[in-house]
C-alpha cells in the first residue's frame, strides 16, 4: 500500500561555538541508515552536504545512525540576520521500510556573539552549599576571570572559584581534557559513583577528584580512548561520559527512575599553531522530545460581558447592542490545551462591517500586536493573570476597545447602521514567554 | 488514587511561627496545571484560602495575611510547606491543604491539622 | 477581593423537598465551584464549573449561573444531603469562598 509522507523521527542537539557550529542528529531506533542533510544556498538551490571545506562545511558519522554538521560561520549556507548566524537544514531519512520521507526542515540559530565564554547562570551558582564546592581555580582569582572559565564567583576567601551545577569542559593548552560533572545536570540527579569514561575504565582514568555533588575528570588527549580527527587544519579530540541508572529490582521486575546520561565532550585546535584551543564543546543527550500528535487546535474570539471576564456573550446574544465609546471586553484563546509552553500571539485584529474579514471598510483595533496609533480611542491591552480557573495565561489575550460605527462612505459623516464584527490573525509559538513568543509594545 | 495529608505542631504559643507540612501521593506538582492550596477553617467558621502553589513555583497569597505567610515546595519529595510568622489566637483553626488540577479547583483535601495558639 | 454572599445561611427542608440555596459574588466570576462539608470532616468538592457535578455526586444536584449571581439545587431532599454548602471562586486571587449556606432536615 501507499505509505504517507511523514516527517523523520529524530533527535538533534545544536551546540554553538566561537567559530562553528556542530548539529548532532540522530534518527530513531527503526531507522536502517543516517539521516541526509541538505542545506538552501543564497540562491534557494537545495545541496546534499558533504566535507566542502571551500563551503565550510563538514559530515562526520556519529555513533548509531547519527550524523554530526559542523560548519563555519563563514559557511556557504549561514546567513547573517538579527545579530544571529542562520542556517536553514533539512533532515531527511528513510524508515523501516524503506519509504521515502518528506524532509524536516530545521533553522540552526547560533549568536553572534559566542567568542566570550558566558558568565554561569547565577541558578548555577546559588543553590550549591560551601562544603559541596569544587574548585575551578586557586585563589585569588578575580570574579572576571573566575567567569572566564565559565565558573562561578564568590567574594570569600576560601574556594572562591568554583564549578556550577553543570557540566564545565576545559581544553588545556597542554593537552588535557578537565570535565567537572554536577549531580544536578539532571533531574532526578545523577549517581555520581556511577559517572565513567565510555571507552575506558582503567584507574588512570578515574576522577581524580569528587564532592557529594562533583566529580572531575582530568586526562590527556592521548589516553582513556579519546579519538582523534584531522581534517585539513584542525584536529578534534573527543571522548564522552556515561552513568548508569539506578535500577530496583523487585520480585516481579525492576524499575528505574533514571534517564539515559550520555556526555559527549570536544575539543578542537588548530595544527599549526600552538595556540589554546579554538572549539570547546559539550554535547548533552537533548532531554526526550514530548509526545506529540497531529489534532486539531482551536482558537476562540469571545466578547466578555464585563472587565472581569467572568462572562461572556454566547452565540444567542449577537449582536451585541453597545452605546457609542462603551467599552468592548475581547478575549482570544487557545481552547483545549494543557501545554504551558504554547504561547498566543495577536498579529492583527481589525473590524468590518461585514462578517467578510477582507471586505472593506476596514478599521485597525491591533497593529502587530499593539493597539493602532491612529485611533483617537486607543485599543487597551489587559493582562491575563493566572488563576485557578486560568492556570496557562499564555493561552489567552485579552483587549478592550471602545464602540465605534463605521461612516458611510458616500454620504459625508453619516454613521453606518449595521453590525461591527472583530477579526484577529494569530500565530501559537512557542516557549511561551521567551522573546520571539511576546509582543513588546512602544510606551504610547 | 490521590492522597493528601497535613502535619503540624498541634500547639503554639502567640508571636510562634507556624510551620505546616503537606505530604501528597497519587500525582506530581511537576505535572503543568497542578497546583497546592493551603485553607483553614476556625471552629465553627467558614473557610478562608491562605496561599497556593503552582508547578511551576508561582506563588498566591491572601493579602489580608502576606507578610506572614511562605508557601514552598519540595517535588521530589511530594511536600508542599507553608510558614506564618507571628501567629496570635485568632490563628487557631483547622489548617487544609488541597490539590487543584487542570479545571479542577481544590479536587482532593487532606484531612486537616489543627493548632491551638494559646499563651 | 470577590467578595461571595451565600444566602440563606441556615435553612431546613423536608425529605422529598427541593432546595435551592444562592451565591453572589461582588465580582462577575466565570465559573462558581461549590464544596460540601460534613460536620468534622474535610470539604469536598461537589460541583465545578458552574454546573459539572464531581464524580460520587447524586444526579438530584444541579448547579447554575453565570456573571455575579449562581444557585445550587437539590431536586428532592434526602437525610445525606444534610451538611454546609460552600462556593468559591477560582477566577481571580485571592481565592474566596462564601460564608456557606448550613442545610438542616426538618
Known amino acids: 500500500g501507499q505509505h504517507k509522507p511523514e516527517a523523520p523521527d529524530y533527535s538533534s542537539v545544536l551546540h554553538c561555538g566561537p567559530w562553528s557550529f556542530q548539529f548532532a542528529v540522530n534518527l530513531n531506533q527503526e531507522a536502517t541508515s543516517p539521516p541526509v542533510l541538505i542545506a538552501w544556498d543564497n540562491q534557494g538551490l537545495l545541496h546534499e552536504l558533504q566535507n566542502d571545506s571551500d563551503c565550510g562545511t563538514w559530515i562526520r558519522k556519529g555513533p548509531g545512525s547519527s550524523v554530526v554538521l559542523e560548519a563555519t560561520y563563514s559557511s556557504c549556507y549561514v546567513t547573517e540576520w538579527d545579530s544571529h548566524y542562520i542556517m536553514p537544514v533539512g533532515v531527511e531519512g528513510a524508515g523501516a521500510a524503506e519509504h521515502k520521507v518528506v524532509t524536516e526542515r530545521k533553522l540552526l540559530k547560533c549568536p553572534m556573539d559566542l567568542l566570550a565564554r558566558d558568565a554561569p547562570d547565577t541558578d548555577w551558582c546559588d543553590s550549591i552549599p560551601a562544603r559541596d564546592r569544587l574548585p575551578c581555580a586557586p585563589s585569588p582569582i578575580s570574579r572576571g576571570d573566575c567567569e572566564g572559565l565559565g565558573c562561578c564567583y564568590s567574594s570569600e576567601e576560601v574556594n572562591s572559584c568554583y564549578y556550577g551545577n553543570t557540566v564545565t569542559l576545559h581544553c588545556t593548552r597542554e593537552g588535557h581534557f578537565s570535565i567537572a560533572v554536577s549531580r544536578n545536570v539532571t533531574s532526578p540527579p545523577l549517581l555520581l559513583d556511577s559517572v565513567r569514561l565510555a571507552l575506558r575504565n582503567d584507574s588512570a582514568c578515574n576522577p581524580v577528584m569528587a564532592t557529594q555533588a562533583f566529580v572531575l575528570f582530568q586526562f590527556p588527549f592521548t589516553s582513556c580512548g579519546t579519538t582523534r580527527q584531522i581534517t585539513g587544519d584542525r584536529a578534534v579530540y573527543e571522548n564522552e561520559l556515561v552513568a548508569t541508572r539506578d535500577v530496583k529490582n523487585g520480585s516481579r521486575g525492576s524499575v528505574t527512575r533514571d534517564s539515559i546520561f550520555r556526555l559527549h565532550v570536544s575539543c578542537s585546535y588548530s595544527v599549526s599553531s600552538n595556540s589554546l584551543p579554538i572549539n570547546v564543546q559539550v554535547f548533552t543527550l537533548p532531554p526526550p522530545f514530548p509526545e506529540t500528535q497531529p489534532g486539531p487546535l482551536t482558537l476562540e474570539l469571545q466578547i466578555a460581558k464585563d472587565k472581569n471576564y467572568g462572562s461572556y456573550y454566547g452565540v444567542g446574544d449577537y449582536p451585541v447592542v453597545k452605546l457609542l465609546r462603551d467599552p468592548i471586553y475581547v478575549e482570544v484563546s487557545i481552547l483545549h490545551r494543557t501545554d504551558p509552553y504554547l504561547g498566543l500571539l495577536l498579529q492583527q485584529c481589525w473590524a468590518t462591517p461585514s462578517t467578510d474579514p477582507l471586505s472593506q471598510p476596514q478599521w485597525p483595533i491591533l497593529v502587530k500586536g499593539c493597539p493602532y496609533i491612529g485611533d483617537n480611542y486607543q485599543t487597551q491591552l489587559i493582562p491575563v493573570q493566572k488563576a485557578l480557573d486560568l492556570p496557562f495565561p499564555s493561552h489567552h489575550q485579552r483587549f478592550s476597545i471602545f464602540t465605534f460605527s463605521f461612516v458611510n462612505p458616500t454620504v459625508e459623516k453619516q454613521a453606518l447602521r449595521g453590525p461591527v464584527h472583530l477579526h484577529c490573525s494569530v500565530s501559537v509559538c512557542q516557549p511561551a514567554e521567551t522573546p520571539s513568543c511576546v509582543v513588546t509594545c512602544p510606551d504610547l | 488514587q490521590v492522597t493528601l495529608k497535613e502535619s503540624g505542631p498541634g500547639i503554639l504559643k502567640p508571636s510562634q511561627t507556624l510551620s505546616l507540612t503537606c505530604s501528597f501521593s497519587g500525582f506530581s506538582l511537576s505535572t503543568s496545571g497542578m497546583g497546592v492550596g493551603w485553607i483553614r477553617q476556625p471552629s465553627g467558621k467558614g473557610l478562608e484560602w491562605l496561599a497556593h502553589?503552582?508547578?511551576?513555583?508561582?506563588?498566591f497569597y491572601n493579602p489580608s495575611l502576606k507578610s506572614q505567610l511562605t508557601v514552598s515546595k519540595d517535588t521530589s519529595r511530594n511536600q508542599v510547606f507553608l510558614k506564618i510568622t507571628s501567629v496570635d489566637t485568632a490563628d487557631t483553626a483547622t489548617y487544609y491543604c488541597a490539590r487543584s488540577g487542570v479545571r479542577r479547583p481544590f479536587d482532593y483535601w487532606g484531612q486537616g491539622t489543627t493548632l491551638t495558639v494559646s499563651s | 477581593e470577590n467578595v461571595l454572599t451565600q444566602s440563606p445561611a441556615i435553612m431546613s427542608a423536608s425529605p422529598g423537598e427541593k432546595v435551592t440555596m444562592t451565591c453572589s459574588a461582588s465580582?462577575?466570576?466565570?465559573?462558581m465551584h461549590w464544596y460540601q462539608q460534613k460536620s468534622s470532616t474535610s470539604p469536598k468538592l461537589w460541583i465545578y464549573d458552574t454546573s459539572k457535578l464531581a464524580s460520587g455526586v447524586p444526579g438530584r444536584f444541579s448547579a447554575s449561573g453565570s456573571g455575579n449571581s449562581y444557585s445550587l439545587t437539590i431536586s428532592s431532599m434526602e437525610a445525606e444531603d444534610v451538611a454546609t454548602y460552600y462556593c468559591?471562586?477560582?477566577?481571580?486571587?485571592?481565592?474566596?469562598f462564601g460564608g456557606g449556606t448550613k442545610l438542616e432536615i426538618k
Open positions: 465580582s462577575s466570576v466565570r465559573y
Open positions: 468559591f471562586q477560582g477566577s481571580g486571587y485571592p481565592l474566596t
Open positions: 502553589i503552582w508547578w511551576d513555583d508561582d506563588k
